[in-house]
């Protein structure tokens, strides 16, 4: 029951996280114009991974896509790639995890197969979450670097005149959405991996019970030794079974009132 709950919760948390990563990737507010000490108040600019938007004092808002690929910073391209990889991995993870859910029966799927699928989806969610967190963090670092460069340029330049970027940008809402979503996807992935351990079928332990005809002299050999009649070749208590496979005889058993020898 706890395993099913952990798996189900992991799935739901990851689902919310991936929805958040998709939302963040599509949002236009990755960076917003810093209004502090900016004399230009007629326009407010905010930018996403795909386009830039301007809201004018009249209330009119216009957005334009970044139609050039070569003119864009490599860091922006890297962030785009990380977010897309995160979404793709997350989507595949969701698909796999749906079939892995313990509460859903598909044909005669073994528990071991479900455990493997749960682990696979969990790892995918973890990588997806890490991609999103990395992407957002790279973008945030780019903004911080640009902010301080812009601040420095405000007080330098030819003849004290600003010669470079005067508009400074600060963190937009999409960054926080991305961080939270990436974290949720990561947590969901960890929960799936934990659930996988509980799903894996454990080897059944049977008490070794031997029934023999009363006419023979029977020796009870506990601790993984084959019960012997005393006439066989195993009179020196040698282990019958070698290798990794465990048999019911190999599971240590102690005599109880139900053991008849």
């Amino acid at each position: 029951m706890a395993v099913t709950a952990c798996q189900g919760l992991g799935f739901v948390v990851s689902l919310i996280g991936i929805a958040g990563i998709i939302a963040a990737t599509c949002m236009d507010q990755w960076s917003t114009q810093d209004l502090y000490n900016n004399p230009v108040t007629a326009v407010f600019n905010y930018q996403g991974l795909w386009r830039s938007c301007v809201r004018e004092s009249s209330g009119f808002t216009e957005c334009r896509g970044y139609f050039t690929l070569l003119g864009l910073p490599a860091m922006l391209q890297a962030v785009r790639a990380l977010m897309i990889v995160g979404i793709v991995l997350g989507a595949i993870g969701l698909l796999v995890s749906i079939f892995a859910l313990k509460c859903i029966r598909i044909g005669s799927m073994e528990d071991s197969a479900k455990a493997n699928m749960t682990l696979t989806s969990g790892i995918m969610f973890i990588v997806s979450g890490l991609c999103a967190i990395a992407g957002v963090s790279v973008f945030a670092n780019m903004l911080v670097t640009n902010f301080w460069m812009s601040t420095a340029n405000m007080y330098t330049g030819m003849g004290g005149m600003v010669q470079t970027v005067q508009t400074r940008y600060t963190f937009g809402a999409a960054l926080f959405v991305g961080w939270v979503a990436g974290g949720l996807t990561l947590i969901g992935g960890v929960m799936m991996c934990i659930a996988c351990r509980g799903l894996a079928p454990e080897e059944t332990n049977y008490k070794a019970v031997s029934y023999h005809a009363s006419g023979h002299s029977v020796a009870y050999k506990p601790g993984g030794f084959k019960a012997s009649t005393g006439f066989g070749s195993n009179t020196k208590n040698k282990k019958i079974y070698d290798g990794g496979a465990r048999t019911e005889d190999e599971v240590q058993s102690y005599p109880s009132k139900h053991d008849y020898v």
Partner: nanobody, 118 residues
Framework: QVQLVESGGGLVQAGGSLRLSCAAS????????MGWWRQAPGSQRELVAI???????QYGDSVKGRFTISRDNAKNTVYLQMASLKPEDTAVYYC????????????WGQGTQVTVSL
């Protein structure tokens, strides 16, 4: 690369008028503003007026009611009509194009001197 060419500066008497123009050549990102800034000797840069690609206009407090900015999007040109000039309007006037592509870009002209005498 965007190039800005300013013209129209010069010497004028107080109360007189001047018209500055600035033509931008090259590829400019669709979202932008074009405008004028000025800097008097020993002073900081000051906003004179800007005109955005969407049609919004903003004036600096010291020139409101006296200066008029206009923009011709087809020619990528911005004009500044200066009237009722005062000696304190004496400064180097810089044309500026700011584009709102990724993290913004600023382009500046070389500046044109405007001197207002009494």
């Amino acid at each position: 690369q965007v190039q800005l060419v300013e013209s129209g500066g010069g010497l004028v008497q107080a109360g007189g008028s001047l018209r500055l123009s600035c033509a931008a050549s090259g590829s400019i990102f669709g979202l932008n503003f074009m405008g004028w800034w000025r800097q008097a000797p020993g002073s900081q840069r000051e906003l004179v007026a800007i005109a955005t690609s969407g049609g919004s206009i903003q004036y600096g407090d010291s020139v409101k009611g006296r200066f008029t900015i206009s923009r011709d999007n087809a020619k990528n040109t911005v004009y500044l009509q200066m009237a009722s000039l005062k000696p304190e309007d004496t400064a180097v006037y810089y044309c500026n194009v700011h584009t709102y592509d990724f993290l913004g870009r600023d382009y500046w002209g070389q500046g044109t001197q405007v001197t207002v005498s009494l």
